[in-house]
Amino acid sequence: MVPEEEPQDREKGLWWFQLKVWSMAVVSILLLSVCFTVSSVVPHNFMYSKTVKRLSKLREYQQYHPSLTCVMEGKDIEDWSCCPTPWTSFQSSCYFISTGMQSWTKSQKNCSVMGADLVVINTREEQDFIIQNLKRNSSYFLGLSDPGGRRHWQWVDQTPYNENVTFWHSGEPNNLDERCAIINFRSSEEWGWNDIHCHVPQKSICKMKKIYI
Amino acid sequence: LGEPQLCYILDAILFLYGIVLTLLYCRLKIQVRKAAITSYEKSDGVYTGLSTRNQETYETLKHEKPPQ
Amino acid sequence: LGEPQLCYILDAILFLYGIVLTLLYCRLKIQVRKAAITSYEKSDGVYTGLSTRNQETYETLKHEKPPQ
């Protein structure tokens, strides 16, 4: 038999035990609090840094696009797709009809200055969308050219030229010296493409990917 | 409600649940210990040495790494 | 780590903590019940065997991996 403990020793032992248990409780609660704080604050900081990133991204565009029009993509409030305010949006791209008249090279430069390219038309639906904003008595440069004059047409963004997805007016292209493509309206065939001399000033259409913030 | 918002609400619920349960567990533990001491006083010394046992157990817990 | 991923990880930690503590709490509660019944049946040895019981309980906690 072990000698009996004094009541005060037992009291002291109980006190120590209580202290240890409550210390554990405090430690556990502190750890929980850390977890919870991390869960609350870090996302807040994440949101903050995301906002900072967004702002810096917006600042990149600010020089030429002082204001953006954004729409929420899907259900997540995190994902916004934006187009510069005067531009129109269709699917994942933004479009701008430049009413200033310039040669093909200058038109492409003008688009690139705005973070875009002359328009590359990939589908009939895209062309149908674009023509809604065009004037029938004007011609507009496309991002399509034949630099060597050998009928090797190429898009400015290196998208492969697919003969099956082209909308040339009948009889076009018809001149090896006409190395740039425009879209224009002909009463007989409505809207279609035509080859013209690159240095003759025309209006143009710029296209850029939507800005995701 | 969006997915992230739900996650935070769940966080808050689990956090509160964790705190309440920690307190209840510690309270129960102390009650058990008090009961053991009371029982010791009433009986002929069943729990001589239990205190060291518990001591060891807490020794181990004490060194446990906190969650990263 | 992305914002939602972090939330889900912390959810998991809090969830595991809640489960472990719930199990421990229930186990302790059952022990107290059993001890009470034993004490009722055998009033001279209120908590016979409780010491090993507690040892096991803490054994469980002791081997638990710390949350990552």
Epitope: M101, Q102, S103, N110, C198, V200 | - | -
Partner: antibody
Framework: DVQLQESGPGLVKPSQSLSLTCSVT?????????WNWIRQFPGNKLECMGY???????YYNPSLKNRISITRDTSKNQFFLSLNSVTTEDTATYFC?????????????WGQGTLVTVSA | DIQMTQSPASLSASVGETVTITCRAS??????LAWYQQKQGKSPQLLVY???TLADGVPSRFSGSGSETQYSLKINSLQPEDFGNYFC?????????FGGGTKLEIK
């Protein structure tokens, strides 16, 4: 070598129409480039008035839009300027010029110019 | 429209001197600038295009420089045939406007 030559009356009465012809030799106006009318006022200020492209499309300076018309006769390799409702402010030397040289970086070919005076 | 401001309006210099004429655009014209020389009673002659490229047959004493909105034409070692009027013209976007001109006279 490309050559441009302006012709037309040197004196026009106010409110009447001014008509000028530009005859081009050495290049077909329907083969390429765009063909401009530029005028120089007595104080030496130069103004682009408008053009007709090789494909027949036109551009007119907005300041003249309602009064100006540029047409062509491809069989004669000529293009024309018509300016309605003239005033004394339209007194100037009128040049016809080929546009689009150097990837549209400068006007290399000019006619020698014709002086038109608007006076009663 | 892009406005072109040319300076000075007139300039007197002696043969052998170096002169500089400047042209300021109201917007970025991306180096699409031409310089012309015009003698009394003649049509303008292209000297420089794309801000710095000399046109065919233009002497090397002429040089163009600049970017964005500020451009200049420099004539080294002035010759008697260099006297006359000089104009700048932008070619960025229609309408292509001219500067007011600089009259270069013999001192």
């Amino acid at each position: 070598d490309v050559q441009l030559q302006e012709s037309g009356p040197g004196l026009v009465k106010p409110s009447q129409s001014l008509s000028l012809t530009c005859s081009v030799t050495g290049y077909s106006i329907s083969s390429g480039y765009y063909w401009n009318w530029i005028r120089q006022f007595p104080g030496n200020k130069l103004e682009c008035m408008g053009y007709i492209s090789y494909d027949g499309s036109n551009y007119y300076n907005p300041s003249l839009k309602n009064r100006i018309s540029i047409t062509r006769d491809t069989s004669k390799n000529q293009f024309f300027l018509s300016l309605n409702s003239v005033t004394t402010e339209d007194t100037a030397t009128y040049f016809c010029v080929r546009g689009g040289d150097y990837d549209d970086g400068g006007f290399a070919y000019w006619g020698q110019g014709t002086l038109v005076t608007v006076s009663a | 429209d892009i406005q072109m401001t040319q300076s000075p309006a007139s300039l007197s210099a002696s043969v052998g001197e170096t002169v500089t004429i400047t042209c300021r655009a109201s917007g970025n014209i991306h180096n699409y600038l031409a310089w012309y020389q015009q003698k009394q009673g003649k049509s303008p002659q292209l000297l420089v295009y794309n801000a710095k490229t000399l046109a065919d047959g233009v002497p090397s004493r002429f040089s163009g420089s600049g970017s964005e909105t500020q451009y200049s034409l420099k004539i080294n070692s002035l010759q008697p045939e260099d006297f006359g009027n000089y104009f700048c013209q932008h070619f960025w976007i229609i309408p292509y406007t001219f500067g007011g001109g600089t009259k270069l006279e013999i001192k």
